[in-house]
Interface confidence: medium
């Protein structure tokens, strides 16, 4: 049997998981969190390539979300806008795993303490942390073989604080994801 | 800066196969998605597919499965896509264009494609 | 839809089923599309400020303060919160 995701030896460094993060949280509809290659967030109501995730610990409590077949993090702004990046941001990447007592576990953004949720309804621009922190069961996932680790540069989300918000006076210089709020 | 050229108009026979360019440059080809849509005249926008040249990984809309295959090759950041067994239904602008977090945020400027006998 | 200069104009866009964001994109009669509003609501570079974009769930709308000359063209949506990626049929805005 696989070590329960309530066990405690996964809550240490270098644990690695493949997981599909299914919620079914009265506010959406039922949905598999899901990295897609463009770098946007989704959820999808069946278990697909781009849902199946690699829950890896970086240290006790904390770890980082990599889609397994686009090899992107997944990573938050500060506003709570989700995002998949080619580049791992320790500040933008690293989520809190809090374990809830019936197999459930919510995510929350150490950086920012924001929860994780799936894109909701509403712009993240204009309504940044609407509800309470969604509550994601994570459904195993058999493990094909791993993908290179990305590089290091990446296209990053486009910054709403810029005066070039899509990088369109030059090409992506490989901005950090931090986003001005 | 960031550009998109796309290869020449093209006349092609009912039946016969096309293969359709879009050369990148001012930007690191394999860290973004390369769509193609269609236009027909007077008509709106369809997406086609879309290729990461990172993971060749494609995504097509399924209208167009069996119609249109898509390839990139990285050595040159050319991006391609190959239509088949063409009809007047094919005779339109096709456009290729870069994919960024959902949006797409440079265009190519188009290519012809007519369909007659 | 037909508008005269300094008129406010405001186009709709409905989706399907809730989608989490709308992009919105400009073509002009011979040219390629440009990208004008994405994530809902932020106006790509270049853009006048004059331009606006809103909505949620399956309402979406780009909004035009107070139409211009240069404003007269069509106007797509387009979304990817599920496959395929879809636009909408356009907007033509013409000038009075």
């Known amino acids: 049997h696989p070590i329960p995701d309530s066990s405690p030896l996964l809550q240490f460094g270098g644990q690695v998981r493949q997981r599909y993060l299914y919620t079914d949280d009265a506010q959406q509809t039922e949905a598999h969190l899901e990295i897609r290659e463009d770098g946007t967030v989704g959820g999808a109501a069946d278990q697909s390539p781009e849902s199946l995730l690699q829950l890896k610990a970086l240290k006790p409590g904390v770890i980082q979300i990599l889609g397994v077949k686009t090899s992107r993090f997944l990573c938050q702004r500060p506003d709570g806008a989700l995002y998949g990046s080619l580049h791992f941001d320790p500040e933008a990447c690293s989520f809190r795993e809090l374990l809830l007592e019936d197999g459930y576990n919510v995510y929350q953004s150490e950086a920012h303490g924001l929860p994780l949720h799936l894109p909701g309804n509403k712009s993240p621009h204009r309504d940044p942390a609407p509800r309470g922190p969604a509550r994601f069961l994570p459904l195993p996932g058999l493990p094909p073989a791993l993908p290179e680790p990305p590089g290091i540069l990446a296209p990053q989300p486009p910054d709403v604080g810029s005066s070039d918000p899509l990088s369109m006076v030059g090409p992506s210089q490989g901005r950090s994801p931090s986003y001005a709020s | 800066q960031v550009q998109l050229q796309q290869s020449g108009a093209e006349l092609a026979r009912p039946g016969a196969s096309v293969k359709l360019s879009c050369k990148a440059s001012?930007?690191?080809?394999?860290?973004?998605?390369i769509s193609w849509v269609k236009q027909r005249t007077g008509q709106g926008l369809e997406w086609i597919g879309e290729?990461?040249?990172?993971?060749?990984?494609?995504y097509y809309n399924e209208k167009f499965k069996g119609k249109a295959t898509l390839t990139a090759d990285k050595s040159s950041s050319t991006a391609y896509m190959e239509l088949r067994s063409l009809t007047s239904e094919d005779s339109a602008v096709y456009f290729c264009?870069?994919?960024?977090?959902?949006?797409?945020?440079?265009w190519g400027q188009g290519t012809t494609l007519t369909v007659s006998s | 839809m037909s508008a005269s200069p300094g008129e406010r104009v405001t186009m709709t866009c409905s989706a399907g089923s809730s989608v989490s964001y709308m992009y919105w994109y400009q073509q002009k009669p011979r040219s390629s599309p440009k990208p004008w509003i994405y994530l809902t609501s932020n106006l790509a570079s270049g853009v006048p400020a004059r331009f606006s974009g809103s909505g949620s769930g399956t309402s979406y709308s780009l909004t035009i303060s107070s139409m211009e000359a240069e404003d007269a063209a069509t106007y797509y949506c387009q979304q990817w919160s599920s496959n395929p990626r879809t636009f909408g049929g356009g907007t033509k805005v013409e000038i009075k």
């Open positions: 001012g930007y690191t080809f394999t860290n973004y998605g």
């Open positions: 290729i990461y040249p990172r993971s060749d990984n494609t």
């Open positions: 264009t870069r994919s960024d977090y959902g949006f797409f945020d440079y």
